[in-house]
Interface confidence: low
Amino acid sequence: NIDVCKLGTVTVQPAPVIPLGSAANISCSLNPKQGCSHYPSSNELILLKFVNDVLVENLHGKKVHDHTGHSSTFQVTNLSLGMTLFVCKLNCSNSQKKPPVPVCGVEISVGVAPEPPQNISCVQEGENGTVACSWNSGKVTYLKTNYTLQLSGPNNLTCQKQCFSDNRQNCNRLDLGINLSPDLAESRFIVRVTAINDLGNSSSLPHTFTFLDIVIPLPPWDIRINFLNASGSRGTLQWEDEGQVVLNQLRYQPLNSTSWNMVNATNAKGKYDLRDLRPFTEYEFQISSKLHLSGGSWSNWSESLRTRTPEEEPVGILDIWYMKQDIDYDRQQISLFWKSLNPSEARGKILHYQVTLQEVTKKTTLQNTTRHTSWTRVIPRTGAWTASVSAANSKGASAPTHINIVDLCGTGLLAPHQVSAKSENMDNILVTWQPPKKADSAVREYIVEWRALQPGSITKFPPHWLRIPPDNMSALISENIKPYICYEIRVHALSESQGGCSSIRGDSKHKAPVSGPHITAITEKKERLFISWTHIPFPEQRGCILHYRIYWKERDSTAQPELCEIQYRRSQNSHPISSLQPRVTYVLWMTAVTAAGESPQGNEREFCPQGKAN
């Protein structure tokens, strides 16, 4: 970087700014009485080329003119776009030890003339805003380029503003700082952009517009909503707008929704009634404005108003189910369960449930309120009982839902037939069945109920259930279904006053069990051996166990073992075998089988039968 040109000057012809592809001549001249002392003839002027402050070339071979010891002219060609620095240095050839001394320097800029600006677009934000225009400048010029935006209009209105582009900033937008008022609505305005740099100038085509073409109203502000008589479905949306607005667009949606409800409102004057809102729902409201029915532009959307509509009393029917358990000869425990209403039915925060148990003939009534979704009571085993549940929020209660308490599996003739459970994928099971063959009364509905077959599941966990219409014979169960867990699935057929059920086990995905059953004892009774075992721990079963296998072989024998396969029953933990020879020592073990395969063997036990075998 040359800062002080004490020793001489550097000039460039035709100019320090040249078009791409042009050549330039750089002349370096020493001032009088400057140069190598005593030996002017030993003055050697050299020219160095720098790009991005890096020396890239010594132009010694490009000399086209030389006044020995006084001045030299160099021709430079093939300069790349942008800025190139040339530094002239004095080399005193009689003193090789001293480095060349800087004389002066010049920066040559290579660029192109500006293209005519295109795609001019002007806007005025709001009635009190100012006109701002933007344009496309075209190709980069690599030079400082000045842009002038000129506007002309009625009554000799003229206005202009300037900005420039360079390697640090881009000029493609200018705010004229003038306001067009609505009284000029029909007037036409013309804007033009002129670009100029050291290599030329160009002008855009004139761009014509009217007030309505360019004025974008400010978005509405101060948005609020008033709910009529605290209604959850009707509200009046209010807002502030600029004075000239004639058309509004409203959009609103529940916060978790993906699609907007759209409304157009003409001459709304900052007010609009909405009648289709969902109670107790978080909504987002936005409004946009326009100054003219047919022309002009819409404003940006306003800031969102987010609010929750008020509550209304619950609607809909609770889904109720129950379990009956005899306690002793004259008492039974009834456990009622119900599913929460979905938000569109609850229409508010459910504060409590009203539960009623009523004996139909004797008019005995038990009533209570609970905040839970289950309720348990002990009642007499005699009589016909009915239960009802309703949900209450701050605005009221839903209509009670009734269910008759019947003996759910009491009528064999109502038991569904050919119940099957098939794995559909990792998290659901397809249950199918056939209707009861000889039902006394019509099936009103089916209930498919399921729970995990794990210790304590009946007391710890509420059941899961699905209500199925009487003409359907299948259900896809997915709620709380996990892979590698066996579920007990019951299909109940309910008539008005009776119930029948069938049971099956099923899983959504299975593997072979991790381990086999553990043989705990082998006992000999009446010429038969009884094998007793403990079941595989629940987490190691990995699905529904279909069979147990008992293997035995003579100790030290290399023959294949014999086996006995037993249908799995949860309640069974012993089994007799009767084909073993007396006074022969046997080794016995067990495995478990799921639909995916057989487990490794459990523990081995040795036993030598004493009695007479069959």
């Epitope: 002080v4 040109c5 320090p16 800025m83 320097g105 010049v106 400082k144 390697n167 640090r168």
Partner: nanobody
């Protein structure tokens, strides 16, 4: 005609920072190349740092590289010299200078501001 006015000089302890400002008036600042020079007692005036009209190119004397930063704010019509890790040999009168283009000699000079580095 361009007038240059420096400010920000003063007494500072060794290792401390100082920020000089230069505000030109009289013509469009954004087309001027700017520089800071200094002159210590009994020594010649020397260039400290320069910056092109766009701010795209800067130059620093070897003695200040890594410690001093030259910058400009075309919107505020001001050039700055941020001086960090000052040393006693930085003591001098600091001058702001300007020229019409990014080459040639400096045409406009300020009156200077004294910077003294001493404990």
């Amino acid at each position: 005609q361009v007038q240059l006015q420096e400010s920000g000089g003063g007494l500072v302890q060794p290792g401390g920072p100082l920020r000089l400002s230069c505000a030109p008036s009289g013509r469009t600042f954004s087309t001027l190349a700017m520089a800071w020079f200094r002159q210590a007692p009994g020594k010649e005036r020397e260039v400290v740092a320069t910056i092109s009209w766009s701010g795209g190119r800067t130059y620093y004397a070897d003695s200040v590289k890594g410690r001093f930063t030259i910058s400009r704010d075309n919107a505020k019509n001001t050039a700055f010299l941020q001086m960090n890790s000052l040393r006693p040999d930085d003591t001098a009168v600091y001058y702001c200078a300007a020229r019409e283009s990014d080459y040639g000699s400096y045409d406009y000079w300020g009156q200077g501001t004294q910077v003294t580095v001493s404990s």
